[in-house]
Interface confidence: low
């Protein structure tokens, strides 16, 4: 189970993980105390290559080709959490692990 | 964490799980002894609706809108295995649990 890593200079057309820094201040999300920004990454690219497909199911659906099936798309296949300090709706400060905030790997599914 | 269920008569445009029976015999996959067919299901539909997004990350990337980011796509968010009886490459009969063969839920990621 693997995925490709790319950067803004890459010429790779296949499904790939790209760096992306999310800046909460830039969004105006001022209820987030820390981190103010973090490396989230994102997935982009084409999915016509079998070796990047995460599940055998993806290949089977491609073969069956049902109505409305758009084919596999490039999406996170492994994600990890980050620890965040933020205000909740009652203006209390919360420290917690927020799941699925960082893309570690991309694949076709 | 939830997803929509549809069928071939649905007018639903959002990301949805549709029924699909995979027929191994029809594919010519004669190394699979059993099952000869099974209900695999598949995902299809649009992903512009926040409530079907699986991860907060999806919403953040949409806000950041990086180059090449195609927006979330409708993909399996929960899958389950099936038990299969099949010939391996050495012509031995194997009985095993094959992961991620059935789509239980679809979402936008």
């Amino acid at each position: 189970d693997f995925g490709l890593d790319c950067d803004e200079h890459s010429t790779e057309s296949r499904c790939c993980r790209y760096p992306l820094t999310v800046d909460f201040e830039a969004f105006g999300w001022d209820w987030i105390i820390a981190p103010k920004r973090y490396k989230a990454n994102y997935c982009s690219g084409e999915c016509e290559f079998v070796f990047l497909q995460k599940y055998p199911h993806t290949h089977l659906v491609h073969q069956a080709n049902p109505r409305g099936s758009a084919g596999p798309c490039c999406t996170p296949t492994k994600m990890s959490p980050i620890n965040m300090l933020y205000f909740n709706g009652k203006e209390q400060i919360i420290y917690g692990k927020i799941p699925a905030m960082v893309v570690d790997r991309c694949g076709c599914s | 964490d939830f997803g929509l269920d549809c069928d071939e008569h649905s007018t639903e445009s959002r990301c949805c799980r549709y029924p699909l029976t995979v027929d191994f015999e029809a594919f010519g996959w004669d190394w699979i002894i059993a099952p000869k067919r099974y209900k695999a299901n598949y995902c299809s539909g649009e992903c512009e609706f926040v409530f079907l997004q699986k991860y907060p990350h999806t919403h953040l990337v949409h806000q950041a809108n990086p180059r090449g980011s195609a927006g979330p796509c409708c993909t399996p968010t929960k899958m389950s295995p099936i038990n299969m009886l099949y010939f391996n490459g050495k012509e031995q009969i194997i009985y095993g649990k094959i992961p991620a063969m059935v789509v239980d839920r679809c979402g936008c990621s």
């Epitope: 105006g28 001022d30 | 806000q63």
Partner: antibody
């Protein structure tokens, strides 16, 4: 104290305009989705529209073009601009706050103002 | 757009009785349903969201259930202070972040 207070209602002639204000206190305006809902005398609730955390607005189909929602974070106030008013727009107008400050529950309003009455009549 | 239909229009029951209010969506809305209570001269109060989650401060005698197109609000033992009009409400993604309310059910105390 956490509260929403609407103002700006009153009597207006058909074809006229009115701007309603919703002053919020006790929380940060930009952290929450805000909505406007109206209720004609003796009738049920009718959704007008929302402004979400990022400032995007969404409207009921009947309100598009005539009604505009905006906000001023520095004044902690949300506005509803109503144009080309008709007799059937006569109602109590409520300002409401979405219950989730991460923007995923745009539609569940857990904090409401007392409402302001708008009467459209000649 | 989704249309929400509530039944009955009016209900008259005695204190202590079990109350069942119904809300039907014109198409599947999964769990995207909220219930509100409104008393005369007051704004609505959120009771239930996501079909079955009790809002903060709401007594446990209120219970929401259902998914897809059929939803129910149950008051296990009616109290005098529960006399009000109850509205269901959904989020309608198809009309791009639209919200639809049911027409309401008025609960009276005998």
């Amino acid at each position: 104290e956490v509260q929403l207070v609407e103002s700006g209602g009153g009597l207006v002639q058909p074809g006229g305009s009115l701007r309603l204000s919703c002053a919020v206190s006790g929380f940060t305006l930009s952290h929450y989705v805000k909505g406007w809902v109206r209720q004609a005398p003796g009738k049920g609730l009718e959704w007008i529209g929302i402004i979400n955390i990022s400032g995007s607005t969404y409207y009921a189909s009947w309100a598009k073009g005539r009604f505009t929602i905006s906000r001023d974070n520095s004044k902690n106030t949300v506005y509803l601009q109503m144009n080309s008013l008709r007799a059937e727009d006569t109602a109590v107008y409520f300002c409401a706050r979405g219950h989730d400050n991460f923007g995923y529950s745009y539609h569940d309003f857990n904090l409401w103002g007392q409402g302001t009455l708008v009467t459209v009549s000649s | 757009a989704v249309v929400m239909t509530q039944s009955p229009a009016t209900l008259s029951l005695s204190p202590g009785e079990r109350v069942t209010l119904s809300c039907q969506a014109s198409q599947s809305i999964h769990h995207e349903l909220s219930w509100y209570q409104q008393k005369p001269g007051q704004p609505p109060k959120l009771l239930i969201y996501l079909a079955s989650t009790l809002a903060s401060g709401v007594p446990s005698r209120f219970k929401g259930s259902g998914s897809g197109t059929d939803f129910t609000l149950t008051i296990s033992s009616l109290q005098p202070e529960d006399a009000a009009t109850y509205y269901c409400q959904t989020y309608d993604g198809i009309s791009h972040y639209g919200v639809a309310f049911g027409q309401g059910t008025k609960v009276e105390i005998k």
